[in-house]
Interface confidence: medium
């Protein structure tokens, strides 16, 4: 299963499969997740070790048993790969590191005014993997405001040094934020020239392209099909790069297929897994296990659940079958790809889905309406559960926010539907940041069912909660993921670090905002809240948030949106933006529906016919 806990002051002994320099434990964990054999990692921050060579060391580890002995090491951080962790799997890393210089090959230098602009330049440069920026207070005047774009053979820094007034970070291309755009075309009977960065075996060009997309130095590829004239080169996928970023030449060649990495695609990247099953094909590799199962799909599921399994072959040979079950060979290799691919067999083969991020796994997202006043712009993928509920009558307009809690479920406020109970007038937009990006061609979800709490009454503040069942399930992406729900009876007073988001008014008599706004707001006790709203009853099923002095709040248009808080290392949906006296007024906190109080109701309503809860819960 998915293991998310980190071990502080602990280092895993042995099992090393790779090592590199990373700026923090989270980036180290991401590299472990995408490494074909890494199950565990240990990271040494600068403060944990005097040995300069080992500072910022990230050690990727494998273990036949899935665990390794932990030794005490002050400052070290260890943990697990996020393989099998569904929507938590992402190669996107947004953090900027202050006082740190990430070294690599400096191939471009320019003057910019901010570190954000430097990161944007890196994201928009095809070869840039990471960058360093010298601030205006850097000790050497001639280097101030320099933005250095960098790459390295492995995609990670060749060294990391502590250096004052320098800020570093990574390209946001894996966040699907590149402005470059990508070539989706696959070119039949064409071979690309230039430098080979890696060679793997794949069953088709599409798997080759996905591997290229997630390889740090692959910009384009050539695949040799299973009927290529040279037998030893059949099914070979050559991952390639060039100085210019594009192939310097291409040659017409029968039975070859070429194409480009999709890392520079905007808004959508392929999943880092391969779900197709290949009938009549055997994948060779190191044997992990052999088990009898009923059908190739069960074989794939078995491989996915066994964390070390990378690919499988399901044999239909009579000697490999008994009754309705046949042998499922679970296999692995050094690079995650088969060591041999054979055609015309009585087997079917495929890959583990452990890196797929659409899985309905049970582990919570670990990131981080009436209206948002005093907030700041959000960035792409920062609040991937936030949705915009829009109404299309003669014109189309944003009315409310909502929170994605499962593939087919959105949680919002009941009052959003006051006077608009018809489901066919609603359009739900997910995975968006700017309302102005919505055009007639932008995909949206339609409503299958609106479930308003049975005790909600129009123009009353109580039970302001509603569920929306979407007509079709949504896939999870970098920008579209669910938020976890709390446990029943969670005490809101013990939450800290809470945020409200939405496109609502930025002042009381304002207008809907274009860019999704965010604001950090402290929770207020119900007793304190009741004092501020003496004409209303603040019930235990509500939670309040706001600053005594006002100035930051939700506002009109934020209703139904999320109030999320970090709780014991995980993010949870604590409240639904409901009501308040004006916006951001002094001593007038915002009032939110307390989600923990409605957990029974949510689970009852989201139960599918097979009794499985269809929302994102942490259990």
């Amino acid at each position: 299963g998915c293991l998310t806990q980190l071990y502080e002051n602990a280092f895993f002994r042995g099992g090393d499969v790779a090592s590199m320099y990373t700026p923090n434990a989270q980036y180290c964990q991401m590299r472990c997740t995408f490494h074909p054999r890494c199950l565990l990692f240990s990271f040494l921050p600068a403060s944990s070790i005097n040995d300069m060579e080992k500072r910022f060391g990230c050690f990727l580890k494998d273990s036949v048993t899935g665990t390794l002995p932990k030794v005490h090491r002050t400052g070290a951080v260890s943990g697990h790969s996020l393989k099998q962790c569904g929507h938590q799997i992402s190669a996107c890393h947004r953090d900027i590191y202050k006082g740190v210089d990430m070294r690599g090959v400096n191939f471009n230098v320019s003057k910019v005014s901010s570190v954000e602009e430097c990161q944007k330049r890196c994201t928009s440069n095809i070869r840039c993997q990471f960058f360093s920026y010298a601030t205006q207070t850097f000790h050497k005047a001639e280097y101030r405001n320099n933005c250095l774009l960098k790459y390295s053979p492995g995609g990670t820094p060749t060294a990391i040094k502590v250096l004052s007034n320098v800020e570093s970070g990574f390209s946001l291309k894996p966040c699907a934020l590149s402005e470059i755009g990508c070539h989706m075309n696959i070119f039949q009977h064409l071979a690309f020239s230039d430098v080979d960065v890696a060679r793997v075996l794949t069953p088709d060009a599409f798997v080759c392209r996905t591997i290229c997309t997630y390889h740090p130095n692959c910009l384009f590829f050539t695949f040799y099909t299973n009927v290529w004239k040279i037998e030893s080169q059949r099914n070979v996928c050559l991952l390639k790069t060039s100085e210019s970023g594009t192939p310097s030449s291409s040659t017409p060649q029968e039975n070859t297929i070429s194409g480009y990495s999709l890392l520079t695609c905007k808004r959508t990247l392929p999943e880092p897994c391969h779900s197709k099953i290949y009938p009549g094909v055997d994948f060779g590799g190191e044997e992990l296990n052999v088990t009898f199962v009923k059908g190739v799909n069960v074989c794939q599921e078995t491989c996915t659940k066994m964390i070390r399994c990378q690919f499988f072959t399901y044999s239909l040979l009579p000697e490999d079958c008994k009754e309705e079950k046949c042998k499922c060979f679970l296999r692995l290799s050094m690079d995650g790809s088969p060591t041999r691919i054979a055609y015309g067999t009585q087997g079917s083969s495929g890959y583990s889905l452990r890196l797929c991020n659409t899985g309905d796994n049970s582990v919570c997202t670990t990131k981080t309406s009436t209206r948002i006043v005093g907030g700041t712009n959000s960035s792409w993928g920062e609040w991937p559960w936030q949705v915009s509920l829009q109404v299309k009558l003669t014109a189309q307009r944003h009315l409310c926010g909502g929170s994605l809690i499962g593939h087919q479920w959105v949680l919002t406020a009941a009052h959003c539907f006051d006077g608009l109970p018809l489901q066919d007038v609603w359009r739900i937009y997910s995975g968006i940041l700017n309302l102005s990006d919505i055009t007639k061609d932008t995909p949206f979800s339609q409503i299958k069912e609106i479930i308003i709490h049975q005790n909600y009454k129009v123009s009353e503040g109580n039970h302001d909660i509603a569920l929306i069942k979407l007509q079709a399930p949504l896939n999870y992406t970098e920008f579209q993921k669910p938020i976890c729900l709390p446990s029943k009876g969670d005490t809101s007073t013990i939450y800290t670090n809470c945020w409200v988001t939405g496109w609502g008014f930025s002042k009381e008599k304002g207008e809907i905002q274009n860019i999704l706004q965010k604001v950090n707001i402290p929770l207020v006790t119900n007793e304190e809240c009741q004092k501020r709203y003496q004409d209303y009853k603040i019930t235990q099923r509500m939670v309040c948030a706001g600053y005594k002095e006002g100035g930051k709040d939700a506002c009109k248009g934020d209703s139904g949106g999320p109030l999320v808080c970090k709780h014991n290392g995980m993010w949870r949906l604590v409240g639904i933006t409901s009501w308040g006296e004006g916006c951001a007024r002094r001593e007038q906190p915002g009032v939110y529906t307390k989600v923990a109080e409605y957990m029974d109701w949510i689970l009852e309503k989201t139960q599918s016919s097979d009794g499985k809860a269809q929302m994102q819960s942490p259990a």
Epitope: Q5, E8, S362, V363, I494, A619
Partner: antibody, heavy 117, light 107 residues
């Protein structure tokens, strides 16, 4: 690694009060709740409640309201549980425990409180 | 409050035996269940949770299953270090509550 160090055993008279301490090491004290659990041979493990050192917020099991009070000192990274009006029914081992998510992943070694005339 | 009922209260077994402990909740707890092991004079140790499954460092001979109100802890092949008391705990609804414990002793 995460460690929770509890104060030593206490022998108390009925009607007295006791303060049990729990020092947190190896993680950011203000980011995680500290929970308290009581263990007796008869009733087994019982959840008393929790404090969030970052916000000062508390949650109590109704059964222990008025009996237990939680506090936390950020500077010393220590959580305290104050038990008042002690009776023989309060004789137990008391544990502080820190969750990851919700389950209790880390435990102190326990503090034995004995109430006897 | 949700009541957690464990059975049996004790079990005698030998090294290599398969041991099964059950835990029944008085209402649906939506898989929010944890299992702990406790040895005499020591604090409980988290073995399995609904959130992350088997805890790091816990041998794979321990496994948890069940849903709704009925849950099971299985030790596939009992080892000498497994003789201890096992508790289940629900964290679906406050107050969090524990089962009364199952003592696994040497036959």
């Amino acid at each position: 690694q995460v460690q929770l160090q509890q104060s030593g055993a206490e022998l108390m008279r009925p009607g007295a009060s006791v303060k049990v301490s729990c020092k947190a090491l190896g993680y950011t004290f203000t980011d995680y709740e500290m929970h308290w659990v009581k263990q007796t041979p008869v009733l087994g493990l019982e959840w008393i409640g929790a404090i969030h050192p970052g916000s000062g917020g508390t949650a109590y099991n109704q059964k222990f309201k008025g009996k237990a009070i939680f506090t936390a000192d950020k500077s010393s990274r220590t959580a305290y549980m104050y038990l008042s009006s002690l009776t023989s029914e309060d004789s137990a081992v008391y544990y502080c425990t820190r969750p990851y998510g919700y389950p209790f992943a880390y435990w102190g070694q326990g503090t034995l409180v004995t109430v006897s005339a | 409050d949700i009541q957690m009922t464990q059975s049996p209260s004790s079990v005698s077994a030998s090294v290599g035996d398969r041991v099964t402990i059950t835990c029944k909740a008085s209402e649906d707890i939506y898989n929010r269940l944890a299992w702990y092991q406790q040895k005499p004079g020591k604090a409980p140790k988290l073995l399995i949770s609904g959130e992350t499954g088997l805890e790091a460092g816990v041998p794979s001979r321990f496994s948890g299953s069940g849903s709704g109100t009925d849950f099971t802890l299985t030790i596939s092949s009992l080892q000498p270090e497994d003789f201890a008391t096992y508790y289940c705990q629900q964290y679906w609804s406050t107050p969090w509550t524990f089962g009364q414990g199952t003592k696994v002793e040497i036959k």
